[in-house]
Interface confidence: medium
């Protein structure tokens, strides 16, 4: 709390300018009118106030707007945004994408702070859904943003927004998140031709079911091993050796290097050794010749 003291003669601020940067804490409190500050917030960012001075300016705004700052002030907070607590931000009603961009710019280059997370949450909730422009903005500043959302939150992403997603935005997504995103991506890219479709859908395939992988295997897509290794194990297991060979194309040789890792290891255990041998890669661990395979899960489903 800053002590209330009278402003010294001749020091009353008529505008927010550089002359204030050497004001003591108490002088700023006494000589800067909060309403003036609010109307000239855009100038604050251009003036290298010290952290101590920013504390005083924030205190003045807090007194002027106890219920939360108006968007006209929020948009011009600049570095003062870094002084805000999540509690402060929860009082705000941010509706403009320009305001969001301005505040994200201040935090650029840093990890997502609790303040930024709260700001984004308030913004998205206010909009009701994660539209394309918002997603575009958020992933530009935080490539990992999508993967920080729960599957429930991701369900509010409209398929049209998927166009804004870049492969690196999905790097840290887990299978549960890709399960939600994949159907949206499939819908978003459905009108594209084969090779273009595969380029776009590739990074979402960690959520693809078996039937879609089977369909892709008929399209000469030449899936790379890195993508194959991210596929759901339960989606890969039912694929035949021929289907995997078609799916991977020339990359099929990479299976040997990955034979001890999932999903390749589990897939090998489900294939007949005869079929694996046709690949000529020396893959071992398949079902020996003459053995009968009972699919107990299918039997249970029928009974």
């Amino acid at each position: 709390e800053v002590e209330k003291t009278a402003c010294p003669s001749g020091k009353k601020a008529r505008e927010i300018d550089e002359s204030l940067i050497f004001y003591k804490k108490w002088e700023l409190e006494a000589c800067v009118d909060a309403a003036l500050l609010a109307t000239q917030m855009d100038r604050v960012n251009a003036i290298p106030f010290t952290y101590e001075q920013l504390d005083v300016l924030k205190h003045k705004l807090d007194e002027l707007y106890p219920q939360g700052y108006p968007e006209s002030v929020i948009q011009h907070l600049g570095y003062l945004f870094l002084k805000m607590s999540p509690e402060d931000i929860r009082k705000w009603n941010v509706t403009s994408l320009e305001t969001l961009k301005a505040l994200l710019e201040v935090n650029k280059g840093h990890e997502m702070s609790p303040q930024v997370a709260t700001l984004i949450d308030r913004f998205v909730k206010g909009r009701g859904q994660l539209d394309k422009d918002t997603l575009d903005t958020l992933t530009a500043f935080y490539p990992g943003y999508l993967c920080s959302l729960s599957p429930e939150e991701l369900s509010s992403v409209p398929p049209s927004s998927i166009w804004a997603v870049r492969p690196q935005d999905l790097d840290t997504c887990d299978p549960r998140q890709l399960d939600v995103l994949y159907p949206k991506a499939r819908l978003a890219f459905q009108n594209m031709n084969g090779s273009e479709y595969f380029v776009k859908i590739q990074s979402f395939l960690g959520g693809a079911p078996t039937e879609d992988l089977k369909a892709l295997s008929q399209q000469n897509v030449s899936m790379d091993l890195a993508t194959f290794m991210k596929l759901r194990t339960d989606a890969v297991l039912p694929l035949t050796v021929a289907e995997v060979q078609k799916l991977l194309g020339p990359h099929v040789e990479g299976l040997k290097a990955e034979e001890r890792h999932r999903p390749v290891r589990d897939w090998i255990l489900r294939q007949r050794q005869d079929d694996l041998d046709t690949l000529g890669l020396g893959l071992q661990g398949g079902i020996p010749n003459g053995y009968l395979v009972l699919d107990l899960s299918m039997q249970e489903a029928l009974s």
């Epitope: 940067i21 290298p48 010290t50 952290y51 101590e52 001075q53 600049g78 570095y79």
Partner: antibody, heavy 121, light 107 residues
Framework: QVHLVESGGGVVQPGRSLRVSCAAS????????MYWVRQAPGKGLEYVSA????????NYADSVKGRFTISRDNSKNTLYLQMSSLRAGDTAVYYC??????????????WGKGTTVTVSS | DIQLTQSPSSLSASVGDRVTITCRAS??????LNWYQQKPGKAPKLLIY???SLQSGVPSRFSGSGSGTDFTLTISSLQPEDFATYSC?????????FGGGTKVEIK
């Protein structure tokens, strides 16, 4: 190449005046706050004075307040420190430094090599 | 004015050693602390600003940490060119103040 070059130092008697200068080059001088920092023989660095980009606002350490005046001429890319009523305790290497603004306040990212001021009778 | 106390005032170390220098502020200064290196007869050089941000061109063996009142400068593996005096400076409020310096000497 960003450069700051101080000049004007020398030996001066107590009570007399001296003006030191700092010529800046390689950057937009008018876009930066500037500082004078000094270092007495065998001692640490001591903040002396600062001036805003347009010269409209200045600040001084208590030890020099009322005796030293900082100023700048943006058309000449030059910073000045007018020192009067000099004392033996003002003997030091005087460095000119550029203030790099950040939201956590100023730090000095470019320094000159310094000019030596010796106050002695 | 905010006082900054550095410790130790001097230390002896060998090439390859990990060196830690501390700076304590007389009141909380958030992350408004900067570190400088100075060699005899030379101008100070900015190493770290805002407590932990490495100035462009400074080797990554230098790192800074801390916030509030306690700060640390660490040199992960001391090199021959690192023997110098290191000073901290606060930019939380004016007047700006410096610590007394820590001289790093060859053992």
């Amino acid at each position: 190449q960003v450069h700051l070059v101080e000049s004007g130092g020398g030996v001066v008697q107590p009570g007399r005046s001296l003006r030191v200068s700092c010529a800046a080059s390689g950057f937009t001088f008018s876009g930066y706050a500037m500082y004078w920092v000094r270092q007495a023989p065998g001692k640490g660095l001591e903040y002396v004075s600062a001036i805003t980009t347009n010269g409209g606002s200045t600040n001084y350490a208590d030890s020099v307040k009322g005796r030293f005046t900082i100023s700048r001429d943006n058309s000449k890319n030059t910073l000045y420190l007018q020192m009067s009523s000099l004392r033996a305790g003002d003997t030091a290497v005087y460095y000119c430094a550029r203030g790099a603004p950040g939201y956590r306040g100023y730090y000095m990212d470019v320094w000159g090599k310094g000019t030596t001021v010796t106050v002695s009778s | 004015d905010i006082q900054l106390t550095q410790s130790p005032s001097s230390l002896s170390a060998s090439v390859g050693d990990r060196v830690t220098i501390t700076c304590r502020a007389s009141q909380s200064i958030s992350s408004s602390l900067n570190w400088y290196q100075q060699k005899p007869g030379k101008a100070p050089k900015l190493l770290i600003y805002a407590a932990s941000s490495l100035q462009s061109g400074v080797p990554s063996r230098f790192s800074g940490s801390g916030s509030g009142t306690d700060f640390t400068l660490t040199i992960s593996s001391l090199q021959p060119e690192d023997f110098a005096t290191y000073s901290c400076q606060q930019s939380y409020s004016t007047p700006l103040t410096f610590g007394g310096g820590t001289k790093v000497e060859i053992k």
